[in-house]
Interface confidence: low
């Protein structure tokens, strides 16, 4: 009889435990940190907070707070058991507190415009200063009852740390609650209110007739000028100058969920979404070993291109990153970090035909943006949780 | 068509145990959370017990906390309820059910605890 | 663990009147609420789920209201076949509860 555990199939020092009951035949007993049938998956230490539906448990990006899950398919809630909202006006409603609700059509589909009492201002009238919203404000966890802008978006809990991204746009001109509606507004279209999502331009996205093939063609090494355009994506910043050293300028480091079995795909939808989504070209950045700047989160490389500081209890609780990226793990979701190159040539008031945010900074603000109105998940293969901007420089080698 | 049916009910002394079983079809089985709910006869529902998608995280009601097992077997689109040190309170029709709006319930089985 | 409470435990009503059930947390559960219609010998049977979205195939008489600790489930106009034992649920957090129940009766 053949021994199911004679060929070792416990990573990390898993010790196996032959089982008939068991589909696979044995059992691992993981070490503290991993988890999964073959301890192949690391385990963030979330003691007794749980994600549902195929949700991911990260560690809190501010230290002292709770771990917090990212969501997948829609559900939402601390632990990830919120069903996804209906698209549109539901039912029900996504408008609370007697807020009434107005389909609109926008580049996610179908979306909606909540009308809200004066004392319920949020996107979803929601109440920011309502009963319980004190101490979850900036705990890493958006709680969308209290995200609004009297509330900082729930302490920048909803809008990727970011506390207002309409910072600088004229506060009774409401622009937060036109974002993204797929209505021009004017009044918004400004680089202070973050172009009004983009509803002003025309045309909103990339012809029909083009759309596939700039998709096949997106980021190749060669630039196609029928796919060089803002709503095309600037064919992944394939026709960017030559001029200086682009390879190595701006740049942003996103982290975000994503399904390692299909870990390629998914990054190549990530950039060109990005890209059509803020009107920059947007592609993979790799490092000088050519190899994409994809970093395992958590795990000291992804937190430092973050730019964050670590949890300092968070080294004991769970064993570090020793499994190469290309490995494929038990899990159906693990956190990355992906460094994205950025070509910021064709924004800027020197191309007052092609608003677009002209600096990382801006871009950080616009994704904010959508994050806060609810339009930035659907349109990813995984939620985003943070994004850092960085200036232009020389990446290290890739010691993974 | 989404089914379930339960099976493995029977009469079982005070103290001792019996194992249910909930075979799942119509459905991805692997993709969803399943509970289990138990009705004393007359009385209203209780929720026992429920297991993530993949097994790996379980609850439990108080009541039966450290006496009932629940496990999945996705290979076999099969849920399981491993009951032990069994009571008289114990005694109804158990019930499972997928997610956590109970959409589609199994016909149940009855469990009767009796010396 | 949170406690769910209905009331009235029984409601008499005329086919064709209007029937409120109500069902209380004791502490707040957001919208994480779900209803039940269950009749002698049957497995309950989902009406509303996230306090006040019906569901698949559910008549448009039955609706859900309410949020945090407070929620009602109205039957605008009694059908014969609606006379039954109806639940409440809430799935906020572990372990989840169900209210007792209330029985709608034919006055």
């Known amino acids: 009889e053949i021994d199911p555990c004679h060929s070792q199939p416990c990573f990390h020092g898993g010790t196996c435990e032959a089982t008939a009951g068991s589909p696979l035949g044995f059992i691992c007993h993981c070490p503290k940190g991993f988890e999964g049938p073959t301890c192949s998956h690391r385990a963030p230490s979330c003691g007794f907070h749980h994600c549902h539906h195929g949700g991911l448990c990260l560690p809190s990006p501010k230290p002292g707070f709770p771990p917090r899950c990212a969501c997948l398919s829609g559900y939402g809630g601390p632990d990830c058991l919120t069903p996804p909202a209906p698209k549109g006006c539901g039912p029900p409603s996504p408008c609370l507190y007697n807020g009434s609700c107005s389909e609109t059509t926008g580049l996610g589909g179908p979306g909606f415009r909540c009308s809200c009492p004066h004392s319920s201002p949020g996107p979803r009238c929601q109440k920011p200063g309502a009963k319980g919203c004190e101490g979850r404000s900036g705990d890493g966890a958006c709680d969308a009852g209290c995200s609004g802008p009297g509330g900082n978006w729930d302490g920048g809990d909803c809008s990727l740390g970011v506390p207002d991204p309409w910072k600088g746009c004229p506060s009774h001109s409401r622009c937060w609650l036109l974002f993204r509606d797929g209505q021009c507004h004017p009044q918004c279209d400004s680089e202070e209110c973050l172009f009004d999502g983009y509803d002003c331009e025309t045309p909103p996205a990339c012809t029909p007739a083009y759309d596939q093939y700039c998709h096949d063609h997106f980021h190749n090494g060669h630039c196609e000028k029928g796919c060089n355009t803002a709503e095309c994506g600037w064919d992944g910043g394939d026709c960017r100058p030559e001029d200086g050293d682009p390879e190595w300028g701006p740049s942003l480091a996103l982290l975000v969920v994503l399904s390692p079995p299909a870990l390629d795909q998914q990054l190549f939808a990530l950039a060109r979404v990005l890209s059509l989504t803020l009107r920059v070209g947007l592609w993979v950045r790799k490092d000088r070993d050519g190899r994409d700047m994809v970093y395992p989160y958590p795990g000291a490389r992804a937190e430092e291109k973050l730019g964050g500081t670590r949890d300092p209890t968070y080294q004991e609780r769970a064993a570090p990153q020793t499994q190469p990226l290309g490995k494929e793990t038990d899990s159906l979701s693990a956190g990355f970090v992906v460094v994205m190159g950025v070509d910021l040539s064709r924004c800027g008031p020197d191309h007052p035909a092609s608003r677009c945010p002209w600096d990382p900074g801006l871009l950080l603000r616009f994704l904010a943006a959508m994050a806060a109105v609810g339009a930035l998940e659907p349109l990813l293969p995984g939620p985003l949780l943070a994004v850092h901007p960085h200036a232009g420089t020389a990446p290290p080698a890739n010691q993974l | 068509e989404v089914q379930l049916v339960e099976s493995g009910g029977g009469l079982v002394q005070p103290g001792g145990s019996l194992r249910l079983s909930c075979a799942a079809s119509?459905?991805?089985?692997?993709?969803?959370?399943m509970s289990w709910v138990r009705q004393a006869p007359g009385k209203g529902l209780e929720y026992v017990s429920t297991i993530n998608s993949n097994g790996g995280r379980t609850y439990y009601a108080n009541s039966v906390k450290g006496r009932f097992t629940i496990s999945r077997d996705n290979s076999k689109n099969t849920l399981y309820l491993q009951m032990g040190s069994l009571r008289a309170e114990d005694m109804a029709v158990y019930y499972c059910?997928?997610?956590?709006?109970?959409?589609?319930w199994g016909q149940g089985t009855l469990v009767t605890v009796s010396s | 663990e949170i406690v769910m409470t209905q009331s009235p435990a029984t409601l008499s009503v005329s086919p064709g009147e209007r029937a409120t059930l109500s069902c209380k947390a004791s502490?707040?559960?957001?919208?994480?609420v779900a209803w039940y219609q269950q009749k002698p010998g049957q497995a309950p049977r989902l009406l509303i789920y996230w306090a006040s979205t019906r569901h698949t195939g559910i008549p448009a008489r039955f609706s859900g209201s309410g949020s945090g600790t407070e929620f009602t489930l109205t039957i605008s106009s009694l059908q014969s076949e609606d006379f039954a034992v109806y639940f409440c649920q809430q799935y906020s957090s572990y372990p989840w509860t169900f209210g007792q129940g209330t029985k709608v009766e034919i006055k």
């Open positions: 502490q707040d559960v957001g919208t994480a």
């Open positions: 119509g459905f991805t089985f692997s993709s969803y959370g």
């Open positions: 059910a997928r997610d956590q709006g109970f959409a589609y």
